[in-house]
């Protein structure tokens, strides 16, 4: 009976999310393998988040708008492990907007989700950021490694969206 009611709850939750995401990919997790964590198909999952690589070329504002239409934000990178996971799926000759910007050019960098900007957990390429006119951050491959670079916000780039996993 308990299992039956849990299944019914799950199904109704799935139907609710179906309006926004036509298809979800879910995995069982938790100590009793009773919880399901889901990401929209074809997003990828890492820890408690889902990620989507957008290959359409857009300005930073449009890229954030595009992520938000999908219920997400431009990616906020919190750890080296997270960055390493994300970069597995990126093309080395492309650049991708991050959810990091310096709106006034005062070198006050801020994440789109208001996560505090911690200088000790940043992955800028050597010599970057280097220009107060370049107020948005990208991740790209340079000198044999992935790192961040400041760029002009209005020049179209690919982007990475991130959202919390859906638990049902």
């Amino acid at each position: 009976n308990f299992m039956y009611s849990k299944t019914v709850k799950r199904l109704s939750k799935l139907q609710e999310y179906q309006q926004y995401y036509p298809s979800l990919t879910c995995v069982m997790e938790g100590k009793d393998m009773e919880d399901w964590s889901c990401c929209p198909t074809p997003w990828t999952s890492f820890q408690s988040s889902c990620y989507f690589i957008s290959t359409v070329m857009q300005s930073w504002t449009k890229s954030q708008n595009n992520c938000s239409v999908m219920g997400a934000d431009l990616v906020v990178i919190n750890t080296k492990e997270e960055q390493d996971f994300i970069t597995q799926n990126l093309k080395i000759n492309s650049a991708y907007f991050l959810g990091l910007s310096d709106p006034k050019g005062w070198r006050h960098w801020q994440w789109v989700d208001q996560t505090p900007y911690n200088k000790n957990v940043t992955f800028w390429h050597s010599g970057e950021p280097n220009s107060p006119d370049e107020r948005c951050a990208i991740i790209n491959f340079r000198s044999e490694e992935w790192g961040w670079n400041d760029v002009h916000c209005h020049v179209p780039q690919k982007s990475i969206c991130k959202m919390k996993k859906i638990y049902i």
């Epitope: 359409v56 006119d133 002009h152």
Partner: antibody, heavy 120, light 107 residues
């Protein structure tokens, strides 16, 4: 004030390459924005061909990808269009324009355009 | 690519009249739409960006509106200098495509 000016041959033979130059004054092409080539066919249809960004990266219209190359000479503040294997279908007025104004909401600065005819 | 369908293809009107040109996108372009005016033998001039924002110096008789996939440019009290061709262009995702144009002629 930002000004753009196209130049190049007005007549190109089929199967040859079309080469055009856009000279920019009033703004350094390495300081910002992205720098486009746009063409307008005889029936007035407009097409974005591709661009080069202030930091030198390119993006091309997929319909032209195998034939197009956009490069620049930063010392002369110029950028260039090369279109290979042209046919009569490439007859058009070619414009250069700056992209990225109004948070990339419209092309505010255009050259006057140069007519290129492809004919034997 | 997002396709832009503009109508009408041509339009005849008199000085003082009000005209409306419409543009339909094949997908949601989230208000990232520009309108241009082009006179014979000249390059296009940007009039409106982000669907409804007028470029500095453009007369207030021009106005843009719309959302989603449907947009329009309205010109109130037509002046002789308003005659020419008008084009819409979306700025949502590369490549930015143009509408086919509307030729506005004096009746």
């Amino acid at each position: 004030d930002v000004q753009l000016q196209e130049s190049g041959p007005g007549l190109v033979k089929p199967s040859q390459s079309l080469s055009l130059t856009c000279s920019v004054t009033g703004y350094s092409i390495t300081s910002g924005y992205y720098w486009n080539w746009i063409r307008q066919f005889p029936g007035n249809k407009l097409e974005c061909m591709g661009y080069i960004t202030y930091d030198g990266s390119n993006n091309y219209n997929p319909s032209l990808k195998d034939r197009i190359s956009i490069t620049r000479d930063t010392s002369k503040n110029q950028f260039f269009l090369k279109l290979n294997s042209v046919t009569t279908e490439d007859t058009a007025t070619y414009y250069c324009a700056r992209g990225g104004d109004y948070d990339d909401g419209g092309f505010a600065y255009w050259g006057h355009g140069t007519l290129v005819t492809v004919s034997a | 690519d997002i396709q832009m369908t503009q109508s009408p293809v041509s339009l005849s009107a008199s000085v003082g009249e009000t005209v409306t040109i419409t543009c339909r996108a094949s997908g949601n372009i989230h208000n990232y739409l520009a309108w241009y005016q082009q006179k014979q033998g000249k390059s296009p001039q940007l009039l409106v960006y982000n669907a409804k924002s007028l470029v500095d110096g453009v007369p207030s008789r021009f106005s843009g509106s719309g959302s989603g996939t449907q947009y329009s440019l309205k010109i109130n009290s037509l002046q002789p200098e308003d005659f020419g061709s008008y084009y819409c262009q979306h700025f949502w995702i590369i490549p930015y495509t143009f509408g086919g144009g509307t030729k506005l002629e004096i009746k």
